[in-house]
């Protein structure tokens, strides 16, 4: 299996944005790559977002996706937006080298994203 590296822990910003790098050790000369972000929480795995891109080009997520990203060589910089405390969990980067054959699959160990909801601003009386 292809090796995929990602950071162990990331803290989301107060605006609910978390960014991390997913890096894969490409054993072949892929031209088309698919990146999928999976969330594992309470032994349940769900797909957060996915994008297919041509090497050297931008990642294209669906319009309603909470993810954005850029690619550079064998690195993908992923950003997940709109996170809330309940979204805290392990976010796994899955990379597939689709074309040309052969197919390679790599799954990272996951990045634990901690999301802390901001404290509401206290009402002020002037």
């Amino acid at each position: 299996a292809m090796h995929v590296a990602q950071p162990a822990v990331v803290l989301a910003s107060s605006r609910g944005i978390a960014s991390f790098v997913c890096e894969y050790a490409s054993p072949g000369k892929a031209t088309e790559v698919r990146v999928t972000v999976l969330r594992q929480a309470d032994s349940q795995v769900t797909e957060v977002c996915a994008a297919t891109y041509m090497m050297g080009n931008e990642l294209t997520f669906l319009d309603d996706s909470i993810c954005t990203g850029t690619s550079s060589g064998n690195q993908v910089n992923l950003t997940i937006q709109g996170l809330r405390a309940m979204d805290t969990g392990l976010y796994i980067c899955k990379v597939e080298l689709m074309y040309p054959p052969p197919y390679y699959l790599g799954i990272g160990n996951g990045t634990q994203i901690y999301v802390i909801d901001p404290e509401p601003c206290p009402d002020s009386d002037f």
Epitope: T31, E32, Y99, P102
Partner: antibody, heavy 118, light 107 residues
Framework: EVQLVESGGGLVKPGGSLRLSCAAS????????MAWVRQAPGKGLEWVAF????????YYADTETGRFTISRDNAKNSLYLQMNSLRAEDTAVYYC???????????WGQGTTVTVSS | DIQMTQSPSSLSASVGDRVTITCRAS??????LNWYQQKPGKTVKLLIY???RLHSGVPSRFSGSGSGTDFTLTISSLQPEDVATYFC?????????FGGGTKVEIK
């Protein structure tokens, strides 16, 4: 139910052109790579061309490179094969097939016959 | 290109017989070996992918095995509806290539 229906085949003179079409239904077309495979009379199967789901990747058999062009219109659930400079040896039944598993073709159409003859 | 050699090119067996078809690749194709069935005058159907995985709706009497360069398609108990030509195909490298086919008939 997955359905693939080819059309556009016919009799053409050497050096002529044809455009084959494949209408897909019963699945989300834009999620799948698609291929054209041909079968000459009484012969085996020969892969012709492949296009990935978003048309990022396109590949051809060596003998077809430069003469054939595979394309797709995901909005119309359609696959195409533009064939130029046709030769007698291009005479075959042309099948469109879905690449539902990496590098395997899991559903095939009934085929459309192309005859190149003077 | 990777050459795929199938044998035998044709065979005749009785209903209930165990039938074996072999496919040899000219180089290692890992697990990217698929088997297809084409009944007379009909289209092509995927039977087995990744050496041994049955495609949906395929009867369990069909099975696949092998590794590297040598692969086998087995019909454990031949049925009249299995009369067809069977093709192997490699998906390891482009161009994707097929075996020459094995025509299976009933005695």
């Amino acid at each position: 139910e997955v359905q693939l229906v080819e059309s556009g085949g016919g009799l053409v003179k050497p050096g002529g052109s044809l455009r084959l079409s494949c209408a897909a239904s019963g699945f989300t077309f834009s999620d799948y790579g698609m291929a054209w495979v041909r079968q000459a009379p009484g012969k085996g199967l020969e892969w012709v061309a492949f296009i990935s789901n978003l048309a990022y990747s396109v590949y051809y058999a060596d003998t077809e490179t430069g003469r054939f062009t595979i394309s797709r219109d995901n909005a119309k659930n359609s696959l195409y094969l533009q064939m130029n400079s046709l030769r007698a040896e291009d005479t075959a039944v042309y099948y469109c097939a879905r690449s539902g598993l990496p590098y395997a073709m899991d559903y095939w159409g009934q085929g459309t016959t192309v005859t190149v003859s003077s | 290109d990777i050459q795929m050699t199938q044998s035998p090119s044709s065979l005749s067996a009785s209903v209930g017989d165990r039938v074996t078809i072999t496919c040899r690749a000219s180089q290692d194709i890992s697990n990217y070996l698929n088997w297809y069935q084409q009944k007379p005058g009909k289209t092509v159907k995927l039977l087995i992918y990744y050496i041994s995985r049955l495609h949906s709706g395929v009867p369990s009497r069909f099975s696949g095995s092998g590794s590297g360069t040598d692969f086998t398609l087995t019909i454990s108990s031949l049925q009249p509806e299995d009369v067809a030509t069977y093709f192997c195909q490699q998906g390891r490298m482009l161009p994707w290539t097929f075996g020459g086919g094995t025509k299976v008939e009933i005695k």
